[in-house]
């Protein structure tokens, strides 16, 4: 038995930040779980981990240097990512593992979300031109 995951097909990260919501066909309330976000078609890069263990407080970390936070809903985890680079535009997959109570459950691979990172506009707006550079 596998948990199903729904994600937005595409998100645009303005100002190098994005919120990605992972919606599960499973209620995470009072469960020990590990929700993670993975980058790339092969999910090779584990971007962020949100670990829940009954307590009210989620533990959040990244082994790959991503700046992230998370928020738990009954059947969802939202990942907040900051300081993304344009070259981190890629497909991102949500993963969920429920460790307790038994049986161990994980998810069918989702369709993923393409996160398109748009860089900050460094050029002055034509309406409000900044100081000219030599």
């Amino acid at each position: 038995n596998k948990i199903l995951v729904k994600q937005s097909p595409m998100l645009v990260a303005y100002d190098n930040a994005v919120n990605l919501s992972c919606k599960y066909s499973y209620n995470l309330f009072s469960r020990e779980f590990r929700a993670s976000l993975h980058k790339g078609l092969d999910s090779a890069v584990e971007v962020c981990v949100v670990y829940g263990n009954y307590s009210q407080q989620l533990q959040v970390y990244s082994k790959t240097g991503f700046n992230c936070d998370g928020k738990l809903g009954n059947e969802s985890v939202t990942f907040y990512l900051q300081n993304l680079y344009v070259n981190q535009t890629d497909i991102y997959f949500c993963k969920i593992e429920v460790m307790y109570p038994p049986p161990y459950l994980d998810n069918e691979k989702s369709n993923g979300t393409i996160i398109h990172v748009k860089g900050k506009h460094l050029c002055p707006s034509p309406l409000f031109p900044g100081p000219s550079k030599p």
Epitope: Q56, Q57, L58, F66, N67
Partner: antibody
């Protein structure tokens, strides 16, 4: 005026526990992420733990993840750090610091620090 | 994690002189670098954030520059109260990390 005042430091034996507190005033405590940063004697600063504004998420440095826990009481404007399984290398001045909930890890105000000494 | 290397370790200067402190990151951190001042027995004080923006109440003699991997803190004319340890810190990658500090001492 923003004020952060740490307390609860002291001498503890290896393997022992301690609970640090940080009393905040002069700002809306529940609007800010809060952090603990430590400084071993004669060394540089090292980030330890953080908690988001409503206390729902936390993160810890790898070296303390299984031993330290961070919490906050927004009704009392107080931040806490529970230190368990203390080791000699945890000896340091522990500072609480605040960070805007949009920048997360930019520490604009710091407390004066609480000295934790781990020694037998 | 990102390593921040500060140089020099110690800078010996006289009041009125210009101080130039360097912080180099092991990989690009865009502009997400802050500088802190710390005096003995005192808490660190935020001077500069986002590489070049002065924090509230910080005198204009303090300025920051740089992006990517190389950053500089400049104190245009040292005042007696500026002799302290200066540390850089990045918030681009998790976990946030600090440099080991540069001590600015009176010559």
């Amino acid at each position: 005026e923003v004020q952060l005042v740490e307390s609860g430091g002291g001498l503890v034996q290896p393997g022992g526990s301690l609970r640090l507190s940080c009393a905040a005033s002069g700002f809306t405590f529940s609007d800010y992420w809060m952090h603990w940063v430590r400084q071993p004697p004669g060394k540089g600063l090292m980030w330890v733990s953080r908690i988001n504004s409503d206390g729902s998420t936390a993160s810890h440095a790898d070296s303390v993840r299984d031993r330290f826990s961070i919490s906050r009481d927004n009704a009392k404007n107080t931040l806490y750090l529970q230190l368990n399984g203390l080791r000699a290398e945890d000896t340091a001045v522990y500072y609480c610091a605040r960070a805007d909930s949009t920048t997360w890890y930019e520490f604009d105000f710091w407390g004066q620090g609480a000295l934790v000494t781990v020694s037998s | 994690e990102i390593v921040l290397t500060q140089s020099p370790a110690t800078l010996s200067l006289s009041p009125g002189e210009r101080a130039t402190l360097s912080c180099r990151a092991s990989q690009s951190i865009s502009i997400y670098l802050a500088w802190y001042q710390q005096k003995p027995g005192q808490a660190p004080r935020l001077l500069i954030f986002d590489a070049s923006k002065r924090a509230t109440g910080i005198p204009a003699r303090f300025s920051g520059s740089g992006s990517g991997t190389d950053f500089t803190l400049t104190i245009s004319s040292l005042e007696p109260e500026d002799f302290a340890v200066y540390s850089c810190q990045q918030r681009h990658n998790w976990p946030p990390t600090f440099g080991q500090g540069t001590k600015v001492e009176i010559k």
